[in-house]
Amino acid sequence: EICGPGIDIRNDYQQLKRLENCTVIEGYLHILLISKAEDYRSYRFPKLTVITEYLLLFRVAGLESLGDLFPNLTVIRGWKLFYNYALVIFEMTNLKDIGLYNLRNITRGAIRIEKNADLCYLSTVDWSLILDAVSNNYIVGNKPPKECGDLCPGTMEEKPMCEKTTINNEYNYRCWTTNRCQKMCPSTCGKRACTENNECCHPECLGSCSAPDNDTACVACRHYYYAGVCVPACPPNTYRFEGWRCVDRDFCANILSAESSDSEGFVIHDGECMQECPSGFIRNGSQSMYCIPCEGPCPKVCEEEKKTKTIDSVTSAQMLQGCTIFKGNLLINIRRGNNIASELENFMGLIEVVTGYVKIRHSHALVSLSFLKNLRLILGEEQLEGNYSFYVLDNQNLQQLWDWDHRNLTIKAGKMYFAFNPKLCVSEIYRMEEVTGTKGRQSKGDINTRNNGERASCESDVLHFTSTTTSKNRIIITWHRYRPPDYRDLISFTVYYKEAPFKNVTEYDGQDACGSNSWNMVDVDLPPNKDVEPGILLHGLKPWTQYAVYVKAVTLTMVENDHIRGAKSEILYIRTNASVPSIPLDVLSASNSSSQLIVKWNPPSLPNGNLSYYIVRWQRQPQDGYLYRHNYCSKDKIPIRKYADGTIDIEEVTENPKTEVCGGEKGPCCACPKTEAEKQAEKEEAEYRKVFENFLHNSIFVPRPE
């Protein structure tokens, strides 16, 4: 029986009965938050062989092993993951071993086994036989291996039953528990699975099979399952579903959801039955279950019941995420906020059409309206009193409407009104009249030339850069000395710079009036010598990174014909020089024969240029005699067990430290202080743990149903 779509077992261990007839769980399996220690021995689910998404275990008291619960779990497909993981075992206080002795394949995703204070038999499992890549596995804060004394079957009797593999240069026996070996297939099978008797399965099988070379005898399928057979692709008139089986059109049309209406049901696209059309596609009509490509961004019509949507916070803007057409009126009233410009762009940046009017008032946090970066049409079907469809009143810091060189905006009906916007130049408003096609509609009082732009540098001269010099982490720039009509009015210059991978930034990107600004700012005093050109050294930059830079002159608010003169440069794009890359990541080596080593690594996190090649160096090392000092198989040599607390363990030094010459004297050596890089890595590690734990809690703690 296929169970799904995802099973959540919590609070009451008897809910496990829901798994009784499941052979495949189509979706995830959560077993969590069972705080009363129970006896799980009577619960056994031998039918369960496959979980198509992920397995999550969290705070289940009394459960000591998973082997009895799921003796035949063979494959976790990881079609959808829990924070990049297909297997999560977290804060399982009594778990002593994983024990999933039939688990042969985790198709996608990594594993996270963390804060399980009593959990052993972790170092005896070779995860590389189960997962494609082990570098993303996260196994920390469990019982320290030296307190576990993990013994594979037969080692005590000196008749080892398990096979050996090499992990991190350690060639050892591989097992799940004290009496269950980790199954390995003969090398003759290659990537294929095998039966219990080591006969190779059909290539379409995954994990295991009940008979060799038979595509109907697979425990799980490598690709897709259809009508009892494992197939490489779904046959005609069937569609891939949940990454593992083939279904027909009726099946797909009959998947229900409590969250969406039947007209928003599953669709068929590109040979797959899926929940909704993928990005860039839209349903081919309201009663269709097929998708067609969108022309431009996919339309999403949003409607405000009360006709006018007030945007006075990020929360209210959030309701418009993804909307391309807004049926109604927008009233923007943003007085304060943190990082407001980029937040508004995130939630309102896709709006292309507003059917009613747009009113921006008392929005002192706004410097620009560029967060409405796709707005191209205001229909003005509903207008404010006085027939206004674009109304801008009392915005103390508004400096820019849009970048009119890259913006087409049409106001189909209605007039514009601007008043009491002291930093908004009238020239900017006149430019909007031309672009939007409203020139001639406004009467004289609609654009107030006295109280718009009264505190802005509206007549700007252009500053020209004269030289630029770069190194790997520095840029030196100079520019022409600006000479206003009265030299005393020039106070200083401000240099603005930021990383700019693409040459598409504008002065107002990410800027608001509450201190958020995506630009770094440096003040530059005037050189005392009037003949020296002003300049700056920008340092602490990243190698091989493109930066955008512009300069503004800071002038006295000297009024000339009712306007303040100012000066600024165009935006200059400049790249720092290349540098030495950081070290390659996740270096792994393994021997696959007596004369070969296979070395794998990931690219450096900071290439600092275009990587052209890697240099691999190796040297022969003498064998470490220390490895042979103890007989690790004898019980009396195993250190006394002490209960781990489930926190992250720092490896203890159990031997006397080596004595070396330190600080000019002989004596025991102190641990070297941590480098900045190590401290940073530890900080990031701790942060990553917190992020995961937050994600876990946010995902699984839900309000009780009423």
């Epitope: 799904g4 189509e26 099946f251 998947i255 959801s257 209406s261 007209s263």
Partner: antibody, heavy 118, light 107 residues
């Protein structure tokens, strides 16, 4: 011929249990969501439950926690397990294959009577 | 849940006349509304699906219209066999719901 044949109705005491069955034929049973609808004597139709093709189940508030819908695709059968029965559960119960939003015709079982009385 | 309200509760019409039945949803359900006819002792029979889609085998005197919250079933010329109870049913959102029914009787 597409048809649904029901069985399992009868007289039961309040607090008792009953299991209704619905055998499907003439179509690919596993490819359709299946519903249960009931009609109390002299009253209108009341939708009570559905199980979709993935096995996801949904219930009306009036039966939630007491009734369980299930299916066995291998046997082409739909079931309704009714526990903690009350007098107000007395009705004719129909199994129903609703023509989905896009395709498929509407099919009803013949109905089976459940009487809850002491 | 979405509440469907049918009106009138009872409609008295003479054979050959036109009958108009109304169904109103408590919130928008798009076109996910179906009309059923039920005669005593029988299972319901689907007449119109998705507000206006006619079905093969159903006489073309039955027609449906509407979308969103207001829907209408029209029987253009009542035949003797049309006197029955008519139900609307929404499948837009779970739980599905039925209207309370409209009884069409001979005047």
């Amino acid at each position: 011929e597409v048809q649904l044949v029901q069985s399992g109705g009868g007289l039961v005491k309040p607090g008792g249990s009953l299991r209704l069955s619905c055998a499907a034929s003439g179509f690919t049973f596993s490819s359709f969501a299946m519903h249960w609808v009931r009609q109390a004597p002299g009253k209108g139709l009341e939708w009570i439950s559905v199980i979709d093709t993935r096995g996801a189940t949904y219930y009306a508030d009036s039966v939630k926690g007491r009734f369980t819908i299930s299916r066995d695709n291998a046997k082409n059968s739909l079931y309704l397990q009714m526990n903690s029965l009350r007098a107000e559960d007395t009705a004719v119960y129909y199994c129903h294959r609703l023509g989905n939003f896009y395709y498929g015709m509407d099919v009803w079982g013949q109905g089976t009577t459940v009487t809850v009385s002491s | 849940e979405i509440v469907l309200t049918q009106s009138p509760g009872t409609l008295s019409v003479s054979p050959g006349e036109r009958a108009t039945l109304s169904c109103r949803a408590s919130q928008s359900i798009g076109s996910s509304l179906h009309w059923y006819q039920q005669k005593p002792g029988q299972a319901p029979r689907l007449l119109i699906k998705h507000a206006s889609q006619s079905l093969s085998g159903i006489p073309d005197r039955f027609s449906g219209s509407g979308s969103g919250t207001d829907f209408t079933l029209t029987i253009s010329r009542l035949e003797p066999e049309d006197f029955a109870v008519y139900y609307c049913h929404q499948s837009s959102r779970l739980p599905h719901t039925f209207g309370q029914g409209t009884k069409v009787e001979i005047k």
